[in-house]
Amino acid sequence: AMHVAQPAVVLASSRGIASFVCEYASPGKATEVRVTVLRQADSQVTEVCAATYMMGNELTFLDDSICTGTSSGNQVNLTIQGLRAMDTGLYICKVELMYPPPYYLGIGNGTQIYVIDPEPCPDSD
Amino acid sequence: AMHVAQPAVVLASSRGIASFVCEYASPGKATEVRVTVLRQADSQVTEVCAATYMMGNELTFLDDSICTGTSSGNQVNLTIQGLRAMDTGLYICKVELMYPPPYYLGIGNGTQIYVIDPEPCPDSD
């Protein structure tokens, strides 16, 4: 399996934005890479977002995705937004080298993202 | 050495308040117990606060202390307030059985407290 590295812990900002780098040890020069972010909480794993990109190009997530990202070599800079305290959990980076063959798969150990809901601002009367 | 248990991770609230329980495996019923909270960051250890209490009574920290606490049996419920993002670090609970003799000492593995500074509220014009 391909090695994937990601930070152990990240704190979301008070605006609910968390960013981390997912780095994969590519055995060669893939031209098409797929990155998926999975969330594990209470032994449940759900897909947060996914993007396929051509090396040297931007990552393109779906329009309604909470993720954005950029790539540089074997590193993917991922940003997840709109996070609330209830979204605290382990976010796992999964990388697939889609083309050219052979297919490679790597899964990181996960980044624990902690999210704290902000206090509401006082009403401006 | 006396065993001391404390949670691995705690998130401070958006108001900068963090609470955790420090539990010590007492060999019996000490009548006088001293609890100290130490902060370890960048291999520096500093004392955050300390209180000596008689079993069954409240913990009394100094008036200007950022800590408050209550005790119940072999558990101490600690609250640290006024925390900022720069205060993120490992907070270690140290428990000493002061009386009756013999003296017992226990030091926990530490609680990693994460603190996120809130976004400032917009000015109310």
């Epitope: - | 060999p27 019996g28 059985l97 009756p100 003799p101 013999p102 003296y103």
Partner: antibody, heavy 118, light 107 residues
Framework: QVQLQESGPGLVKPSQTLSLTCAVS?????????WNWIRQFPGKGLEWMGY???????YYNPSLKNRVTMSVDTSKNQFSLKLSSVTAVDTAVYYC???????????WGQGTTVTVSS | DIVMTQSPDSLAVSLGERATINCKAS??????VAWYQQKPGQPPKPLIY???YRYSGVPDRFSGSGSGTDFTLTISSLQAEDVAVYFC?????????FGAGTKLELK
Amino acid sequence: QVQLQESGPGLVKPSQTLSLTCAVSGYSISSGYYWNWIRQFPGKGLEWMGYIGYDGSNYYNPSLKNRVTMSVDTSKNQFSLKLSSVTAVDTAVYYCARNYYSGYFDSWGQGTTVTVSS
Amino acid sequence: DIVMTQSPDSLAVSLGERATINCKASQNVGTYVAWYQQKPGQPPKPLIYSTSYRYSGVPDRFSGSGSGTDFTLTISSLQAEDVAVYFCHQYDTYPLTFGAGTKLELK
């Protein structure tokens, strides 16, 4: 490593006073802890009899009424038990043991068997 | 006095199987409960104190749980050397008291 060792007569006549001594090595009894006597009846049940503290304080099991007295000899690093007006029901293995105040017993002697019989 | 009621009186368990001994206090004793193991001709030996903490040198197959009035000693995988009598003990309130003991045998 603290060690406790009981000594005393193995046979006591009814109505007499049972006297036992516990010699402590590896720890000074005046430095701390509480020094207890516990007995185990032939049916294997354990009964805590009381303690004498490092400071000379004591507390006895109310079930023994006024029959029990404990004392300490710091110069010999030993403590003693006296149980008066014994009857056959006081036949038991007598252990000395150490604990923290109102604590569990972390060190025990090997025990000495006392039989009350005429 | 606080009465510690131990159950069962005796228990036969196969090697490698789990053994569970229960102790019920007649009133709340918090977490101030210890467990001892006694083999023939020997004094009781501390296994667990403060409900769930293993005494120094005690194998991790021994564990304790509970609080208040109900407590349990568990041996996760019985070994031949675990055959003994086990006692619970409350040290919350004087006079300190013990359970009557559970004799653990090999099946």
